[in-house]
Interface confidence: low
């Protein structure tokens, strides 16, 4: 991306889309009134510069060179109802939830076909992750290129991440880190955790001492999923930034190559932000690059990153895989998974802010009982009649949906989605098989979390080499 | 290399206790984990119970609790489990073994060489 | 509670010989199995961790596979030592439990 003003009207047309959905996402989250003015004048100066550079009105479901599909919405309807996505909100008006495919025409990624999925297998000589085989997992970056490499022999490493905004961690926060340990296992590569506690500082109403307590907190959790200590290394920024300069070099590196112009297209910053939330992109961008790491990867430049992540981390991504080649680094890969939608409904993700929108990993089983019976969004029928003869609606109904997640056995997922679509399960009987699932898999994971001591969260984040020679 | 030293065998009478210690070396006894096991030729090993000796938290298997107490002495190094109101269900070869996290996916690595209980009138 | 079942209690195999113990679990432990040798003397050794990671220390003729709920301890060319018994054991949940044992004695 250039170093100027948008320089097409397709630039143009997606900093509007953002910039809508930033406005969107300022209502949504009850931010001043000077926030969202400011955030809407920007909003109608970019229109009108499309308008005058175009000819014609923006339409969001119509971008440049596109002829416009036919459709009886008028421009301002079809906008309230595009699904938008940047990361610090997530809308849809749809109680499917967000349409991934459309996701990736926007993003302009890949969508991880049944190929790929074969690719892999043949590549690990390993069965698929459920994530990969029920498209959880279902976009990508470069994916073939990273199984060239190690087709080939040549080192890749993971990179995933965690932005540590509270001490209570929900189950939808551990699908990047459920994945990027069987990735771990089956490419037996190097893996880095960045935990942004000074994104959260930037962001969010804490002291540093508090965002750094919660990172240390999150990664006994992420620990507890199972990773390998000799072969992962978990940082905290306001930690390892402060002692790497080769972490250091590189974020001041991307910082000089991005300019405010593209941080404010790609994540909708207004002149009323801090500094530290506009330059914050170069620091997640950072860790891509291996020499970010010398402990690990001495100072090699070429070892091509794969970062595991939600889909609306891709933003950061996209500026990370735009400046690359301008400093001299490989372009990092991407897998992109869906969303974890909240337990009222797939209409939003689900946030630690709300106690009943998520089940949290330090909930007893007795309060997912009662969460799943009481919060979860039902795709059943009103009465059991009406459920017997017509079946409940597995694309809408949330305990299916998280069953898809953590129900690994293909066969009794698919029975149970053919019991309920056609009516012989009803909705308390999906339930029960939820929280069946769901109450061994907390216990569990609260079980592993207390074999973590402060002496192995210490050794996970101390800057050390990993059992990985790179010459 | 870690190495447990388990204290002696016991004989005793029905309804009585027992202290058996469980003295850790060659490593940080604070960061490890000690866990307790049950071997007899009937039922096999069956799990009794750990505890963090970083901060004494315990976590036991129901079948154990009331009948297994769990405690450390930092400052020595050393484990101790007391079983309480002894019936002859109790004789047994107890272990303690040291569990390892991280490289080891939970894994008890280091055992000590077992005290044996017999309970006996 | 986990149910850990080896099913066969004794096997008898010469010098040289290539033996497999097999372990099978109630449910899906997603590979969080480990495999210990007790010698007649009652000491414990951890062999195999995480279904396939030889601890330090262990010989490379003692391997291990599986998944879900299949489990094996593999001893490729068997040595006077390896007379022994072999426990396997699941560590996904609390509380932790074992196998009854495989003995392997000397044919």
């Known amino acids: 991306m250039p170093n100027s003003e948008p320089a097409s009207l397709l630039e143009l047309f997606n900093s509007i889309a953002t910039q809508g959905e930033l406005v969107r996402s300022l209502k949504a989250g009850n931010a001043s009134k000077d926030e969202i003015d400011s955030a809407v004048k920007m909003l109608v100066s970019l229109k009108m510069s499309y308008k005058a550079a175009a000819g014609e009105d923006y339409k969001a479901d119509c971008p440049p060179g596109n002829p416009a599909p036919t459709s009886n919405h008028g421009p301002d309807a079809t906008e309230a109802e595009e699904d938008f996505v940047d990361p610090w909100t997530v809308q849809t008006s749809s109680a499917k939830g967000i349409d991934y495919d459309k996701l990736i025409v926007r993003f302009g990624s890949s969508k991880i076909d049944k190929e790929l999925i074969n690719r892999i297998e043949r590549a690990t000589g390993q069965r698929p992750h459920h994530f990969l085989r029920r498209g959880i997992f279902f976009s990508h970056r470069d994916m073939n290129q990273v199984l060239d490499a190690y087709e080939n022999k040549k080192p890749f490493y993971l990179y995933t991440g965690r932005g540590p905004s509270s001490e209570a961690m929900h189950v939808g926060h551990l699908i990047p880190f459920i994945f990027t340990k069987w990735l771990q296992d089956v490419f037996n590569v190097p893996l880095v955790i960045q935990m942004t506690d000074d994104e959260k500082y930037l962001w969010k109403d804490l002291t540093l001492d508090q965002a750094y307590s919660y990172a240390v907190e999150n990664a006994k959790d992420i620990i507890a999923c199972g990773f390998d200590i000799n072969k992962t290394f978990i940082f905290s920024d306001l930690d390892y930034m402060g002692m790497s300069s080769g972490f250091y070099k590189n974020v001041v590196k991307i910082q000089k190559h991005v300019t405010f112009n593209q941080v404010k297209g790609i994540f909708g910053f207004t002149d009323s932000d801090c500094i530290g939330k506009i330059s914050f992109p170069a620091i997640q961008a950072a860790p891509s690059f291996s020499n970010s790491f010398p402990q690990i990867f001495r100072d090699r430049t070429d070892i091509q990153c794969l970062i595991p992540c939600a889909i609306d981390q891709d933003p950061y991504f996209r500026m990370t895989r735009d400046v690359a080649p301008r400093i001299g680094y490989p372009k990092p890969a991407l897998l992109h998974s869906t969303f974890f939608p909240a337990l009222q409904g797939a209409q939003t993700k689900m946030s630690a802010s709300d106690p009943n929108s998520s089940i949290f990993l330090t909930d007893t089983a007795k309060q997912i009982k009662t969460k799943v019976n009481k919060h979860a969004f039902s795709g059943g029928r009103d009465t059991i009649e009406e459920h017997r003869q017509f079946g409940g609606n597995c694309d809408v109904d949330v305990s299916f949906m998280y069953l898809t997640f953590f129900l690994e056995d293909d066969d009794k997922l698919e029975q149970i989605r053919k019991d309920y679509t056609s009516g012989a399960m009803l909705t308390g009987e999906l339930k029960k098989a939820l929280i069946e699932v769901l109450q061994p898999l907390i216990a569990e994971h609260q079980a592993r979390r207390k074999e973590v001591t402060d002496e192995i969260v210490k050794e996970f984040m101390t800057p050390r080499k990993l059992s990985f020679d790179f010459q | 290399q870690a190495y447990l030293q388990q204290s002696g065998a016991e004989l005793v009478r029905p309804g009585a206790s027992v202290k058996m210690s469980c003295k850790a070396s060659g490593y940080t006894f604070t960061s490890y984990n000690m866990h307790w096991v049950k071997q007899t030729p009937r039922q096999g090993l069956e799990w009794i119970g750990a505890i963090y000796p970083g901060n004494g938290d315990s976590s036991y298997n129901q079948k154990f609790k009331g009948k297994a107490t769990l405690t450390v002495g930092k400052s020595s190094s050393t484990a101790y489990m007391q079983l309480s109101s002894l019936t002859s269900e109790d004789s047994a070869v107890y272990f303690c073994?040291?569990?390892?996290?991280?490289?080891?996916?939970?894994?008890?690595?280091?055992w000590g060489q077992g005290t044996s209980v017999t309970v006996s009138s | 509670d986990i149910q850990m079942t080896q099913t066969t209690s004794s096997l008898s195999a010469s010098l040289g010989d290539r033996v497999t113990i097999s372990c099978r679990a109630s449910q899906d432990i997603s590979n969080y199995l480990n495999w210990f040798q007790q010698k007649p003397d009652g000491t414990v050794k951890l062999l195999i961790y995480y279904t396939s990671r030889l601890h330090s220390g262990v010989p490379s003729r003692f391997s291990g596979s599986g998944s879900g709920t299949d489990y094996s301890l593999t001893i490729s060319n068997l040595e006077q030592e390896d007379f022994a018994t072999y426990f396997c054991?699941?560590?996904?949940?609390?509380?932790?439990?074992f196998g009854g044992g495989t003995k392997l004695e000397i044919k």
């Open positions: 054991q699941q560590g996904k949940t609390l509380p932790h439990t």
């Open positions: 073994a040291r569990w390892h996290y991280g490289s080891t996916y939970y894994a008890m690595d280091y």
